[in-house]
């Protein structure tokens, strides 16, 4: 599936996301992870998802954003983190979204 550009795994019970996902799907532009059980994001989580334009993370249990998980997403247009457990609008330790 290396040519895949859109992946919808919404409404599952995914609690951990392996960073190698995007290494195996280098063309991925749209990733929908809504309504899963993710609790944390790190700067490794999407490090290899450099072509993403849309990332849907709404309705998870994300409470911890460690370091700068979106710093490599130079093409990101849509990021949805609604309905999570974030206590701050700070999405990491530096400005990441240009």
């Amino acid at each position: 599936y290396s040519q895949l550009t859109s992946l919808d795994v919404g409404f599952n019970t995914i609690s951990k996301l392996e960073p190698e996902l995007c290494q195996k799907l280098p063309m991925l532009k749209v990733l929908n992870l809504q309504h899963n059980e993710l609790s944390q994001l790190s700067d490794k989580t999407f490090a290899f998802c450099t072509n993403l334009t849309e990332l849907h993370l709404m309705s998870n249990s994300i409470q911890k954003i460690k370091n700068n998980p979106f710093v490599k997403q130079k093409n990101l247009i849509t990021l949805d983190l609604s309905h999570n457990g974030l206590s701050s609008t700070k999405l990491g330790t530096q400005v990441q979204l240009e």
């Epitope: 190698e20 290494q23 609790s39 790190s42 490794k44 989580t45 911890k64 460690k66 206590s87």
Partner: antibody, heavy 117, light 107 residues
Framework: EVQLQQSGAELGKPGTSVKLSCKVS????????MHWVNQRPGKGLEWIGR????????IYGEDFKTKATLTADTSSNTAYMQLSQLKSDDTAIYFC??????????WGQGVMVTVSS | DIQMTQSPPSLSASLGETVSIECLAS??????LAWYQQRSGKSPQLLIY???RLQDGVPSRFSGSGSGTRYSLKISGMQPEDEADYFC?????????FGSGTKLEIK
Amino acid sequence: EVQLQQSGAELGKPGTSVKLSCKVSGYNIRYTYMHWVNQRPGKGLEWIGRIDPANGDSIYGEDFKTKATLTADTSSNTAYMQLSQLKSDDTAIYFCAMGEFDYFDYWGQGVMVTVSS
Amino acid sequence: DIQMTQSPPSLSASLGETVSIECLASEGISNDLAWYQQRSGKSPQLLIYAASRLQDGVPSRFSGSGSGTRYSLKISGMQPEDEADYFCQQNYKYPLTFGSGTKLEIK
């Protein structure tokens, strides 16, 4: 299956150095952080530091900034820790561990380092 | 550095009994807490992360709870294989720090 295989026990003389290795199978270390933790005889766990194998960036605990040097080789999927200027209180079991979020999902079996003249 | 004060240092429990271990952080750690089990002569094994999330493959008799500075690990129904040392660890801030451990023995 993810496995962390550490090198064998080390006997070092005071003032010398030892280099420990931790070979990871079943997971690419570029996708995580490699940590090192020690446990002195009969004692608890103490964090030494961690390395990001993707770029070599390291963070050390205060007591280990001049004691430990962490490196990683992504081509062999191996992390290393060098302990320098060995002293008797460096005698401990040293564990490598993997963790993307600074807790440790997987651990090596541990290696005993004994410092004695 | 964040100090992790773990109690009790040792604990004896009968098979089937429910036991709790506590960890108190010197400042708030926002649920960035993990619990490990270390059987004699073995490496530690992750039980709980993010204060209450059960690591894959860990029996459901283990549970974690807490918030702010105070956290606990509960074993609901002690089993022979639960005889081990238990450690908490904060991953909120560097340097990462561990509690001093609790030795759990079968009565």
